[in-house]
């Protein structure tokens, strides 16, 4: 008789999840030799231990602490790029500007990027059928708690000038409910962080509005200022040109506003 299985509203664990995490770990430690001390089998065991045999709506940050410890990594605290709803451009940017880091440029972020996972209470099985949806099922699910944990730690590590890339094409350029708005903003350390600089990325080619005056950006400025952190904002009118100028800063067309 097949055992009854909880049906969740979200997609199930990414196929070949264990193999993917292990392979990503090995690849990351090769690309980043300063992390060559990491034992990827131990990393996978710690990752697995965070959610296997646990109810997927009852995961805590504490469950991920062994993984956090194994994945401890130093990134230059003044070279951190946060992002919200514009992941691809943020990643394209750090692939060119190699001394800056998004969360997904760190080991733990790299391991989990675009993956889904969950287990089942009292069984060692991984659930490949369905996993809890943050809205429809529960917020304390394995994926959401993981990103909340690593995002908090990443923001806490930041110092000096912290940059954030925001999507100017969205109705809420700054969304209080995003990971950036709900976790990272509130975990920047005022004693270490001098300024949060927002880069608002424009979508339309003819869009010349000053999106730094958007009400949601003003809301972000208010939250940041109340935390005794300075705020600045720049419009990136031409993201394609912006990336090109990061690649070739000496190009004569890169002196004008982008």
């Amino acid at each position: 008789v097949p055992r009854w299985r909880q049906q969740w509203s979200g997609p199930g664990t990414t196929k070949r999840f264990p193999e993917t995490v292990l392979a990503r770990c090995v690849k990351y430690t090769e690309i980043h030799p300063e992390m060559r001390h990491v034992d990827c089998q131990s990393v996978w065991d710690a990752f697995k231990g965070a959610f296997i045999s646990k109810h997927p709506c009852n995961i805590t940050e504490e469950d991920y602490q062994p993984l956090m410890k194994l994945g401890t990594q130093t990134v230059p605290c003044n070279k951190i790029l946060l992002w919200s709803r514009i992941k691809d451009l943020a990643h394209q940017f750090t692939q060119v500007q190699r001394d800056m880091f998004t969360l997904e440029d760190t080991l733990l972020g790299y391991l989990a990027d675009d993956l889904t996972w969950c287990g089942e209470f009292n069984t060692s099985k991984i659930n490949y059928q369905s996993c809890p949806d943050w809205r429809k099922d529960c917020s304390n699910n394995p994926v959401s708690v993981f990103w909340k944990t690593v995002s908090r730690r990443f923001a806490e590590a930041a110092c000096d000038v912290v940059h954030v890339m925001l999507n100017g094409s969205r109705s809420k350029i700054f969304d209080k409910n995003s990971t950036f708005g709900s976790v990272e903003v509130h975990n920047l350390q005022p004693e270490k962080v001098q300024t949060l600089e927002a880069w608002v990325i424009h979508g339309g080619r003819e869009d010349s509005r000053d999106l730094c005056q958007d009400p949601t950006i003003k809301e972000l400025e208010s939250i940041i200022s109340k935390r005794n952190i300075q705020f600045s904002c720049k419009n990136i009118y031409r993201p394609d040109k912006f990336l090109q100028c990061v690649k070739n800063p000496e190009d004569s067309s890169c002196t004008s506003e982008i």
Epitope: E30, P33, E34, H37, R98
Partner: antibody, heavy 113, light 113 residues
Framework: SVEESGGRLVTPGTPLTLTCTAS????????MSWVRQAPGKGLEWIGF?????ITYYASWARGRFTISKTSTAVDLKITSPTTEDTATYFC???????????WGPGTLVTVSS | AQVLTQTPSSVSAAVGGTVTINCQAS????????LSWFQQKSGQPPKLLIY???SLASGVPSRFSGSGSGTQFTLTISGVQSDDAASYYC?????????????FGGGTEVVVK
């Protein structure tokens, strides 16, 4: 242990390949580094090769050297030697936390016309 | 590029005395502690003494010790013995994607009287 070979007298511009042979451990389990030392001078890191053959070079060494590996050896090619490349070349096994826990005795390269 | 500056370039010590060698990095080493010390005797390859700032490599006598963090590091030889006459090099590690992975200091010659 590790041992370097291939060092000799060459004329400027003549490519030269040095070989590092490992025994007692597998090259697929370690990064391997090349370091050089000009006569009477200090140590200079050239570059290293990862377990899966990804290479990293010192900024000054890029384009001047090529590191490659087989299952049994790691090679360092000096693409176009100049007199400044006269040095003893060391191969070292890179451990988890340092540039080398196991070094070869070195091989001397002399570049002279 | 990152630079590791070692001071002094040469130091003389009596048997039983103490030697202190300083190593200053132009930027913080990886994790604030990825700094190693090597000993090199004439005609020999370098030998790893200390890794991760203060951890003693296997078989290294406890009279060698390391300390420091970030950009400032020190190697101390307490109760110097005649066998300690050698050149000493610090070596820092940095994030490879944005800098040279490994950089050596210029070296310090220790003379034992």
């Amino acid at each position: 242990s590790v041992e370097e070979s291939g060092g000799r007298l060459v004329t400027p511009g003549t490519p030269l390949t040095l070989t590092c042979t490992a025994s007692g451990f597998s090259l697929s389990s370690y990064y391997m580094s090349w370091v050089r030392q000009a006569p009477g001078k200090g140590l200079e890191w050239i570059g290293f090769i990862s377990k899966t053959a990804i290479t990293y070079y010192a900024s000054w060494a890029r384009g001047r050297f090529t590191i490659s590996k087989t299952s049994t050896a790691v090679d360092l090619k000096i693409t176009s030697p100049t007199t400044e490349d006269t040095a003893t070349y060391f191969c070292a096994r890179v451990d988890a936390y340092s540039a080398g826990d196991l070094w070869g005795p070195g091989t001397l390269v002399t570049v002279s016309s | 590029a990152q630079v590791l500056t070692q001071t002094p370039s040469s130091v003389s010590a009596a048997v039983g005395g103490t030697v202190t060698i300083n190593c200053q990095a132009s930027q913080s080493v990886y994790s604030d502690n990825r700094l190693s010390w090597f000993q090199q005797k004439s005609g020999q390859p370098p030998k790893l003494l200390i890794y991760s700032t203060s951890s003693l490599a296997s078989g290294v006598p406890s009279r060698f010790s390391g300390s420091g963090s970030g950009t400032q590091f020190t190697l101390t030889i307490s109760g110097v013995q005649s066998d300690d006459a050698a050149s000493y090099y610090c070596q820092g590690e940095f994030i490879c994607t944005s800098a040279d992975c490994f950089v050596f200091g210029g070296g310090t010659e220790v003379v034992v009287k």
